[in-house]
Interface confidence: medium
């Protein structure tokens, strides 16, 4: 068999609620994927699980099943959302993230995706994982790759 | 049409405390922040401070934190000042105007007179 | 605070004159300047903001230069309404901050 190629391609959109109460954060990350098929055969891909983590925290987990086929030669992109909570011992971030005497309250995510896939009774899974910036201050739709974290200092503006 | 439309003029005696309002109009009042801005007779402008609607965040300018308190009624669409304490230097036209996260003003509202005389 | 100072605070032009108003901060605020006309009985209107951005529905006689320090509000070709009062404004930092302002009057 050819190999199932998985690229994370970023973020799409974040969708941020608080609960001031309780100095929570909710963030709904929409992430998306493009999946490869470079046999010459349909392969299903079965199912889709996420995790979201910050500062070395699990933040929020998603699991998607029975996703779709994908046929020979071809390649689908698929969205997924992840529900993430940042709270308790984090609770200190809703005054960062709703602070408004800055303009853009950029966090750094860590998104870990794998992607299992199947074909004549074989399965496979596929793990990527990457740094995301996400703004937690506002809603935001990001173009594809926008959010990336790189880990250089860039210059200033 | 975005519009912000305030309450009426006022005349308060020193040492009182008045809350001014500002009905937002013609778009989705948790979008966008709201800024309030003082402009004394024959002056300039003065920013006192923003009020997210979506999460009732606030930022004062410290020349103004203890003059005023920014509020907001989601459902009624209302921002509102509270001034206490006044004296004549409060005495002026009082602007609500609303701003995205890049900190200018898109729309103003039609301001609000606010006279402090015994 | 960023310091504004607007020059000058009175200017008088004829229509079809072009005329430039400056603004120049204590300290460099990138391109975020933004400029606002006041006009009575009628709401403060945003002209540009970031320096040089047109906001929509404002006529292309509007154009606003400069980054840093320096800025400049140029009207071009002045219409009869266009005599008002402008303002400029920071949006770089907290606390906001204006320019005193200029009186655009018709000579």
């Known amino acids: 068999p050819r190999s199932i190629e998985v690229k994370y391609i970023g973020v799409k959109s974040a969708y941020v609620s608080y609960d001031a109460e309780k100095r929570t954060i909710y963030l709904n990350i929409t992430n998306t994927l493009n999946i490869t098929n470079n046999n010459y055969y349909s392969v299903e891909v079965e199912n889709i699980t996420a995790q979201v983590q910050f500062s070395k925290t699990v933040i929020g987990k998603a699991r998607l099943n029975n996703i779709t086929n994908i046929g020979p030669l071809d390649m689908k992109q698929i969205d997924y959302t992840v529900p993430t909570v940042i709270a308790e011992e984090m609770s200190y971030m809703y005054d960062f993230c709703t602070l408004l005497s800055i303009k853009v309250h950029n966090i750094v995510l860590m998104m870990q995706v794998t992607v299992t896939t199947a074909y004549f009774g074989h399965s496979e899974q596929i793990s990527q994982e990457r740094y995301q910036y996400v703004d937690c201050g506002r809603n935001t739709t990001y173009q594809l790759a926008q959010s990336e974290y790189l880990n250089v200092l860039q210059p200033q503006q | 049409e975005v519009q912000l439309q305030q309450s009426g003029p006022v005349l308060v005696k020193p040492g009182a405390s008045v809350k001014l309002s500002c009905k937002a109009s013609?778009?989705?009042?948790?979008?966008?922040?709201m800024n309030w801005v003082k402009q004394s007779h024959g002056k300039s402008l003065e920013w006192i401070g923003v009020?997210?609607?979506?999460?009732?965040?606030?930022s004062y300018n410290q020349k103004f934190q203890d003059k005023a308190t920014l509020t907001v009624d989601k459902s009624s669409s209302t921002a509102y000042m509270g001034l206490n304490s006044l004296t004549s230097e409060d005495s002026a036209v009082y602007y609500c105007?609303?701003?995205?996260?890049?900190?200018?003003?898109?729309?103003w509202g039609t301001g609000t007179t606010v006279t402090v005389s015994s | 605070d960023v310091q504004i100072t607007q020059s000058p605070s009175y200017l008088a032009a004829s229509p079809g004159e072009t005329i430039t108003i400056n603004c120049r901060a204590s300290?460099?605020?990138?391109?975020?300047l933004a400029w606002y006309q006041e006009k009575p009985g009628k709401t403060n209107k945003l002209l540009i903001y970031?320096?040089?951005t047109l906001q929509s529905g404002i006529p292309s006689r509007f154009s606003g230069s400069g980054s840093g320090t320096d800025f400049t509000l140029t009207i071009s070709s002045l219409e009869p309404e266009d005599f008002a009062v402008y303002y400029c404004?920071?949006?770089?930092?907290?606390?906001?901050?204006f320019g005193a302002g200029t009186k655009l009057e018709l000579k």
């Open positions: 105007a609303n701003g995205n996260y890049d900190w200018y003003f898109d729309v």
């Open positions: 300290r460099s605020i990138s391109k975020y």
């Open positions: 970031s320096g040089s």
């Open positions: 013609g778009y989705t009042f948790t979008d966008y922040y």
């Open positions: 404004q920071q949006h770089n930092e907290y606390p906001l901050t």
């Open positions: 009020i997210n609607p979506y999460n009732g965040a606030t």
